[in-house]
Interface confidence: low
């Protein structure tokens, strides 16, 4: 915007906004006037009010620029001392409204500076964890998930630097996938696909468990909860569909309390679900222990 | 630099398996996912699916439900991808990729042509 | 799955020529959209991802934009070595899935 009589630019780091003093133009009106702050991009504009003193019917409003449309931040209502307003744009302008004399104008002093923008703050996964080093460009977020759930998406975000910065990518999910293999299994935990929430129909999904050299498997079933028709889990003795197995739910109608024991380092753990019904599925908690 | 080497072309009779090897050099392999992409001859790219090296978790494309297995060594910055019950439709050139840093499939191995024919 | 669907499937055009690839995915996948670049024999290149933000190293003549369910790759000015195929993704949902494609032939 070109300055007026009454409007005034601002362009570094930080700088002061005070209210007019002595203007050479006839102000048998009052005053409109301007102050345009603008700040490096990737920057916010943050407005400390220093002091403030207006006259009844005097209005001061705080715009933030550089969006679609103007975004309202604050009116004299809402400046009192030592509020502090911030633009999330790197722009920001004052409207400083007077009323005519012989009254004569109100008083304020506003301090404005320039901070850095930031990332949001990333969603936690359901069934997982974020840690963030910092929302600032150049931090990043590590996501992990609860045991038996898998990374789906990127496991490190980078707040990339931008006019409005921005994560590099999606925000991941936890998810209980259908099927996987698990090398080195020492401790852990394999769930179905949307536990603790009911499996989906047509499922087929394979596990392979596959302890460290030297050592086997103990399987706990902490939870097994199949519909009443043709859904079926079955636990091999072995690396592969072939394997016979030591667990069928056709066969048994109770649960082995004392879990399984694998006699190499190997569980092939298979879940099939019909086309009816569902129910909340399994979790089984798996450790390896020395032969 | 990042590097992604994979194994070398492989000739297969139907109903047969391949596994093709995708080694990582150049980065903390158990840092990133690694992704496996195909390309059938003259067809779109289709994503098979991942595995997250630090824990040997893997997600798979639902279409290939129970006929892939990809698996890591992480002691040799290897990926690798197996493939089952192999039918003519899947001759293809199998890439790996290392995914989601700034951009997904950010890069590729060299390619791997399996082709299956009787 | 989200379909991918680009146009045009393909495309003849000169050196200096100013060139738009269209994709269109069957749901808004909000901006999670990345192109890329494939020459006969080769790994595909990463040009374009987040709809718009240009990968390191690729040069500036190729530009993204785009939102909710239609984005589209522009080329400034053919050069020789951009003639090949270009792929579109979406990595909104998960599969992600490709376009088909779209060659770039020498008129």
């Known amino acids: 915007q070109t300055p007026g009589p009454c409007s005034w630019n601002f362009s570094g780091p930080e700088g002061s906004l005070d209210s007019p003093t002595d203007l050479s133009s006839p102000t048998d009106v009052g005053l409109d006037c301007f102050f345009y702050i603008s700040v490096y991009p990737g920057y916010g504009v943050e407005i400390k009010v220093q002091n403030i003193s207006l006259r009844e019917g005097e209005t001061v409003t705080v715009e933030g620029l550089g969006g679609p449309d103007p975004l309202p931040l604050a009116n004299q209502s809402f400046l009192l001392r030592g509020q502090v307003i911030r633009s999330p744009t790197h722009q920001a302008a004052l409207r400083f409204q007077s009323l005519p004399p012989p009254a004569g104008p109100g008083t304020f002093h506003f301090h404005y500076q320039a901070y850095l923008l930031s990332c949001h703050f990333p969603r936690r996964p359901a069934y997982g964890d974020v840690t963030v080093t910092s929302l600032h460009p150049g931090g990043s977020a590590r996501f992990h998930c609860a045991t038996g759930y898998q990374l789906k998406g990127a496991r490190h975000l980078t707040c990339l630097n931008a006019t409005q910065p921005f994560w590099d990518s999606k925000e991941p999910v936890c998810i209980a996938a259908c099927g996987g293999v698990i090398r080195n299994a020492t401790t852990g935990r394999i769930v179905s696909p949307g536990f603790p929430g009911n499996y989906s129909n047509n499922l087929t999904c394979h596990w392979l468990l596959e302890a460290p050299e030297g050592q086997r498997l103990h399987l706990h079933f902490e939870k097994v909860s199949l519909a009443e028709d043709d859904d079926r889990l079955i636990i091999r003795n072995g690396d592969n569909v072939e394997a016979p197995p030591v667990y069928d739910s056709y066969e048994v109608e109770y649960l082995p309390i004392e879990g399984l024991l694998s006699s190499g380092k190997h569980f092939f753990v298979e879940l099939s679900t019909d086309s009816s019904g569902a129910a909340a599925g399994m979790a089984l908690r798996y450790e390896a222990f020395q032969q | 630099q990042v590097q992604l080497v994979q194994s070398g072309a492989e000739v297969k009779k139907p109903g047969a398996s391949v596994k093709v090897s995708c080694k990582a050099s150049?980065?903390?392999?158990?840092?990133?996912?690694m992704d496996w992409v195909r390309q059938a001859p003259g067809q779109r790219l289709e994503w098979i699916g991942y595995?997250?090296?630090?824990?040997?978790?893997?997600g798979y494309n639902q279409k290939f439900k129970g006929r892939v297995t990809i698996t890591v060594d992480t002691s040799a910055s290897t990926a690798y991808m197996e493939l089952s019950s192999l039918r003519s439709e899947d001759t293809a050139v199998y890439y790996c990729?290392?995914?989601?840093?700034?951009?997904?499939?950010?890069?590729w191995g060299q390619g791997t042509l399996v082709t299956v024919s009787s | 799955d989200i379909q991918m669907t680009q146009s045009p499937s393909s495309l003849s055009a000169s050196v200096g020529d100013r060139v738009t690839i269209t994709c269109k995915a069957s749901q808004d996948i909000n901006s999670y959209l990345s192109w890329f670049q494939q020459k006969p024999g080769k790994a595909p290149k990463s040009l374009i991802y987040?709809?718009?933000r240009l990968v390191d190293g690729v040069p500036s003549r190729f530009s993204g934009s785009g939102s909710g369910t239609d984005y589209t790759l522009t080329i400034s000015s053919l050069q020789p070595e951009d003639f090949a195929t270009y792929y579109c993704l979406q990595y909104d949902e998960f599969p992600p899935t490709f376009g088909q494609g779209t060659k770039l032939e020498i008129k």
């Open positions: 987040r709809a718009n």
């Open positions: 990729s290392r995914s989601i840093t700034t951009a997904w499939f950010a890069y």
């Open positions: 595995i997250y090296p630090d824990n040997g978790g893997a």
């Open positions: 150049g980065y903390t392999f158990t840092d990133y996912n």
